[in-house]
């Protein structure tokens, strides 16, 4: 297993609709054809997997149908979007990149993007 540098923004504020996007960029030492991207969330010292996708270079990322993540790739950059976020989802979102094929296997883990989320103000009750 060889190490690889992964860069991501330090802080992002999600939109009022609970959507946060950020780029995860990796310094690929070679010509990988199969890449796996995993988003991990760290909060209160606990790390949980948010979503993961494996893609062939030049193809779209495919997350599971029920995933809260979507993404696109361009060269050594992956543009990740996480949807359906609420204030309680505020935390450090870490991008993990694995170059699966061809060998050798490379692993890179970013420092994390602190995503802040604020729940939208409830609409005032209207009289009908």
């Amino acid at each position: 297993c060889k190490a690889m540098h992964v860069a991501q923004p330090a802080v992002v504020l999600a939109s009022s609709r609970g959507i946060a996007s950020f780029v995860c960029e990796y310094a690929s030492p070679g010509k990988a054809t199969e890449v796996r991207v995993t988003v991990l969330r760290q909060a209160d010292s606990q790390v949980t997997e948010v979503c993961a996708a494996t893609y062939m270079m030049g193809n779209e990322l495919t997350f599971l149908d029920d995933s809260i993540c979507t993404g696109t790739s361009s060269g050594n950059q992956v543009n990740l979007t996480i949807q359906g976020l609420r204030a309680m989802d505020t935390g450090l979102y870490i991008c993990k990149v694995e170059l699966m094929y061809p060998p050798p296997y490379y692993l890179g883990i970013g420092n994390g993007t602190q995503i802040y989320v604020i729940d939208p103000e409830p609409c005032p009750d209207s009289d009908f």
């Epitope: 923004p9 330090a10 802080v11 992002v12 504020l13 999600a14 939109s15 009022s16 996007s21 950020f22 909060a43 209160d44 204030a87 505020t90 450090l92 602190q114 802040y116 989320v117 604020i118």
Partner: antibody, heavy 117, light 108 residues
Framework: QVQLVQSGAEVKKPGASVKVSCKAS????????IGWVRQAPGQGLEWMGW????????NYAQKLQGRVTMTTDTSTSTAYMELRSLRSDDTAVYYC??????????WGQGTTVTVSS | EIVMTQSPATLSLSPGERATLSCRAS???????LSWYQQKPGQAPRLLIY???TRATGIPARFSGSGSGTDFTLTISSLQPEDFAVYYC?????????FGPGTKVDIK
């Protein structure tokens, strides 16, 4: 080195607007946020809100909602805070600070805004 | 919003003494998002401690932070003349971020 440099002192009349700038250097501007904090004479620190330089999204303190606008110009690594309909109790030193998630680690030198008729 | 309170409002001590400053949050705050700042007259605040217990770059070892949940403490083990200032705690766990009212450490 990492630093934030703010615009100079301003004297404004009640009802006017003020726009304070905060120029960042020494780091990747879009990787962080810029927060704004003010301090009235002899008082403590008051959080005004912040802007994510990465995507331009903002979050403002409730009491300033509708009067404050925070923006960034990523081409010049500069953040701006505009406060409208100024009142005498807006007289304060206004600070910008880098938001990184876990502390405001770099602060501007402060901009004194005086509201007086 | 999370309301931060600090005690005491003023702490009068002599150089060389130990200072213990308290900060309480109105609801639980992850320790990763609790910071302490020092402010001297006419100067901008300076980050001392982040993550409740990690000293910021260049901060002397006499400053230490501890605590979790709703109760946090800043300790200055042996006060130096340059340590007499106002100290603020702040949370950036929930939006909006909020500061405590400050504790003034002055010379007895």
């Amino acid at each position: 080195q990492v630093q934030l440099v703010q615009s100079g002192a301003e004297v404004k009349k009640p009802g006017a607007s003020v726009k304070v700038s905060c120029k960042a250097s020494g780091y990747t501007f879009t990787s962080y946020g810029i927060g704004w904090v003010r301090q009235a004479p002899g008082q403590g620190l008051e959080w005004m809100g912040w802007i994510s330089a990465y995507n331009g999204n903002t979050n403002y303190a409730q009491k300033l909602q509708g009067r404050v606008t925070m923006t960034t110009d990523t081409s010049t690594s500069t953040a701006y805070m505009e406060l409208r309909s100024l009142r005498s109790d807006d007289t304060a030193v206004y600070y910008c600070a880098r938001v990184r998630g876990g502390g405001l680690d770099v602060w501007g030198q402060g901009t004194t805004v005086t509201v007086s008729s | 919003e999370i309301v931060m309170t600090q005690s005491p409002a003023t702490l009068s001590l002599s150089p060389g003494e130990r200072a213990t400053l308290s900060c309480r949050a109105s609801q639980s705050v992850s320790s990763s998002y609790l910071s302490w700042y020092q402010q001297k007259p006419g100067q901008a605040p300076r980050l001392l401690i982040y993550g409740a217990s990690t000293r910021a770059t260049g901060i002397p070892a006499r400053f230490s932070g501890s605590g979790s949940g709703t109760d946090f403490t800043l300790t200055i083990s042996s006060l130096q003349p340059e340590d007499f200032a106002v100290y603020y705690c702040q949370q950036d766990y929930n939006l909006p971020f909020t500061f405590g009212p400050g504790t003034k450490v002055d010379i007895k």
